[in-house]
């Protein structure tokens, strides 16, 4: 059957019908419903929400909706022994204590089970010592401290400001520097935009607001006790000492009122430059320890959280494909929140809900997609992408054979300025073509396309007249699908103006103030940006599931491979003498990229010309497109990161949120001048060039004529 026979309606009409069915008012209603109480992973409230979503997706018309449960390691504060930080005097008396909870927002004073701010998976402990301020606790910040300023963090408690990089990387860096505790805080420089009021009068972070979050370094492992395998009924669990990615030192987050009290007393070295100064009225001295009058005072942490194996629930909905039911297009986003989840994740979950409703409406009218669409409401994303990873581990054999694409659907907004897209190069043309067909919601762009407003506000740094599309990193549920399994993936949301707003993320991220009212009053009163994001995410899913030929352009991969090869070569060429000494050549990589480019070009020509009415040939060509992303997977994984297996992209070793290209070569070259054995270090660079060149060549050959 052709796609049209299977679906009874022309493809163009289908897409229009699907998009027209999406309603801003419904997204608003769903967001309200999902945000009235906390939905922390592992709790009864989040289980009940899973059952509600299951029931509603069934009502919407999906063929089946099941709960998939796993028993994973989670972390919770101790209700009777709260976590806090104190300043103690020489007698050990606590002369200042940080707050035990955030002041609840108006209207939420009587809500129970608001988890107090904590760093999930922190070990228990009560370390005390001198404080060292380490800026953002990035790799380069510790280089500055240790190498330039000769400041030793060993045995110290470090205080770092949130922002720039994933908090887990900050903790890892502090551990490696020998710190015995970490205090994380939100500086107004990063979480308070000038000219905007604090919540509840605006979208800025109040002084008592605190960012929660996990501090794991899982590197894609999923549940720390069952790496590589699902945490099912018969799982064999590692002991806690062998668990993957757990921090070894106590960690706790605070707001800027409390941070002020700790930082105002700091003595020792002055900040090395202005980039180490935030916006508090404190000197931003690095330390160690407090200044003269307060030099006998110390900082003490009191952390009593526990790690517990707890049941989590994914909701998995299926809309069976009419022609290729064994090809899966997946739309997934998480359901669990730190507190109310006004933006993260429920602004995304509400959009998924409306997309499911629209697809269900079409199905009830007799339509089916060509390919199967799977919808997922993931649990325990906030605790390390656990729900999505466990499900993918359980279903890996199906996914690696049948997975066409994964579209992520966490927060729909992090601002209201323009679109932001991160995806595989295979989806660039899909995103461009789709956004040209959608209306822009932006003021001043009435009657213009989304593509036009997006390109104007966020231009590509390389290609004029095109919008910026970024590399996929991690920190969200696409990780296992893209980085481990090699399934083409993408994500889209509305974002802020990065030029004028230098704060990290959005100010109220992971705080109690991330409420429905935050979105409805300050970010998107008409829910027009949510609707646009629904159209982009839903439109991508629709096209991926329904187009006769998969909407992937392999030529775009060729373009970026050349760009990434040029970039990594230029990094290596900062060491021309060593490259000569150790005979380091990138010829094999550039040759492989050239071959890929030529083969991709020929494949694209064949794709235009082949007989689309021949179902065998159609399926063959589509399979070559589907399996191209899979061809970039190295079964052995990256060094010391076995679950990051994509050779072209991986989360940065210095910032989980950021994507790095040719990560194996990049990491081998990183700080190579400081390696004790240069011969061994450059040998590893050569090995990584070999792996990358082989992988690009092997991927190219999957696009060659089959016989």
């Amino acid at each position: 059957k052709s796609s049209n026979e299977a679906t009874n309606i022309t493809p163009k009409h289908n897409m229009k019908a699907f998009l027209d069915e999406l309603k801003a008012e419904n997204i608003k209603k769903f967001l309200y419903n999902f945000t009235q109480i906390p939905h922390l992973a592992g709790t009864e409230q989040n289980f009940q929400l899973a059952k509600q979503i299951q029931s509603q997706w069934k009502e919407f018309g999906l063929d089946s909706v099941e709960l998939a449960h796993y028993d994973v390691l989670l972390s919770y504060p101790n209700k009777t022994h709260p976590n806090y930080i104190s300043i103690i005097n020489e007698d050990g008396n606590e002369i200042f204590n940080t707050s035990l909870f955030e002041p609840p927002p108006p209207g939420y004073e009587n809500v129970s089970d608001i988890v107090p701010p904590f760093s999930a998976f922190s070990p228990q402990g009560m370390p005390e010592g001198d404080l060292v301020y380490v800026n953002y606790a990035r790799t380069e910040d510790f280089f500055k401290l240790e190498r330039d300023m000769k400041i030793n963090c060993s045995g110290k408690i470090v205080i770092a400001r949130y922002g720039k990089v994933f908090r887990g990387n900050k903790v890892k860096n502090a551990q490696l520097a020998g710190a015995k505790g970490v205090i994380l805080y939100s500086d107004p420089a990063d979480y308070f935009a000038p000219g905007v009021k604090s919540y509840p009068d605006g979208w800025n972070l109040p002084g008592g607001g605190v960012q929660r979050g996990n501090i794991l370094n899982l590197n894609g492992a999923g549940d720390p006790l069952t790496p590589g395998y699902p945490a099912n009924e018969y799982a064999y669990r590692r002991g806690i000492a062998e668990a993957v990615g757990l921090p070894s030192i106590p960690v706790h987050p605070i707001g800027y009122y409390d941070a002020q009290k700790l930082l105002e007393k700091m003595g020792g070295s002055a900040p090395p430059d202005s980039s180490w100064r935030g916006s508090l009225k404190v000197p931003y001295n690095v330390g160690p320890g407090f200044t003269g009058n307060f030099s006998t005072q110390k900082v003490k942490m009191h952390i009593h959280s526990t790690n517990e194996v707890t049941r989590i629930y994914n909701v998995i909905g299926t809309l069976r494909g009419a022609v290729e039911p064994d090809r899966y297009v997946i739309l997934g986003g998480h359901r669990d929140s730190w507190v109310f989840g006004g933006i993260d994740p429920q602004s995304g979950a509400a959009v998924v809900h409306e997309i499911v409703r629209s697809f269900g409406t079409l199905k009830k009218e007799g339509w089916r997609p060509r390919r199967t669409i799977l919808f997922a409401s993931w649990d325990a994303e906030e605790f390390g992408l656990l729900g999505s990873t466990e499900w993918a581990e359980e279903n890996s054999r199906l996914l690696q054979e049948r997975g066409v694409a994964y579209i992520n659907a966490d927060s729909s907004i992090e601002g209201n300025y323009t679109l932001r897209v991160d995806c595989t190069p295979l989806m660039y043309s899909l995103v461009h073509n789709l956004t040209k067909e959608l209306k822009s919601p932006d003021e001043g762009f009435e009657g213009k396309s989304l593509y036009e407003s997006w390109t104007k506000k966020s231009p590509s740094p390389e290609f004029s007249g095109m919008p910026r599309i970024s590399k996929l990193g991690s920190g969200n549920d696409f990780e296992v699908f893209f980085q481990r399994l090699g399934i083409a993936s993408g994500r889209a949301r509305y974002t802020k103006n990065w030029e004028t707003n230098k704060f990290s993320g959005y100010p109220l991220y992971h705080s109690v103030y991330e409420t429905y009212e935050l979105v409805e009053k300050f970010y998107d009163p008409m829910f027009k940006y949510h609707l646009t994001v629904a159209q982009v995410r839903g439109g991508m899913v629709f096209e991926l599931a329904n187009s006769i030929v998969l909407p992937f352009d392999c030529r775009d991969y060729a373009v970026v491979l050349r760009k990434y090869a040029d970039k990594i070569y230029s990094i290596s060429m900062k060491h021309p003498q060593e490259m000569k000494t150790y005979s380091v050549s990138f010829d094999s990589l550039f040759s492989a990229v050239k071959n890929f480019t030529e083969i991709a070009s020929k494949f694209s020509e064949r794709l235009q010309d082949f007989d689309k009415s021949n179902p065998i040939v159609l399926r063959m060509m589509n399979d070559q497109l589907m399996f191209l992303e899979r061809a970039f997977i190295d079964p052995l994984g990256l060094p010391d990161r076995p679950f990051y297996r994509h050779v072209i992209y991986a989360p940065s070793s210095h910032n989980k949120y950021a994507g790095e290209s040719f990560p194996g070569i990049y990491d081998a070259l990183f700080d190579i001048e400081s390696k004790v054995d240069p011969s061994k270090a450059w040998g590893e660079v050569k090995r990584q060039i070999y792996v990358a060149a082989f992988t690009v060549q092997a991927a190219a050959e999957t696009l060659s004529e089959v016989a």
Epitope: G42, T43, E44, N46, F47, D71, L73, L74, Y76, K79, T80, D113, L225, E233, Y234, R237, I240, T306, N307, E308, V309, T310, R311
Partner: nanobody, 127 residues
């Protein structure tokens, strides 16, 4: 069918020690928390110590911290409570309780989180 069977109660002098055991039978993989609760004559039942079966995390009542130790042997499906430096106020009927894996109890040491109970074993501490 899931069952919890206690053993090891008895009488002891102040300062003495006892060890309680709780054997879980049936579909024990369904338990997330197992622990001990006690009821002194004329008083309400209270949490003593509980353990997360999957990873061994523990919660203790303040009154027993440092004196009692709860531990698990997953291969034998048993939970043990080692009770040292016993006091007369530790006297009571000690129950083993299990919480099914469903969702996390808001407070793992509160009895309303537990839906499977043993018969109880008597501990008497005399001065």
């Amino acid at each position: 069918q899931v069952q919890l069977q206690e053993s090891g109660g008895g009488s002891v002098q102040t300062g003495g020690s006892l060890r309680l055991s709780c054997a879980a039978s049936g579909y024990t993989a369904s338990f997330s928390w197992i622990g001990y609760f006690r009821q002194a004559p004329g008083k309400e039942r209270e949490g003593v110590a509980v353990i997360n079966v999957g990873v061994g995390s523990t919660y203790y009542a303040d009154s027993v911290k440092g004196r009692f130790t709860i531990s698990r042997d997953n291969t034998e499906n048993t939970i043990s409570l080692e009770m040292n430096s016993l006091k007369p106020e530790d006297t009571g009927l000690y129950y083993c309780a299990g919480s099914l894996r469903w969702s996390r109890p808001p407070n793992p040491i509160s009895e309303d989180a537990y839906n499977y109970w043993g018969q109880g074993t008597q501990v008497t501490v005399s001065s």
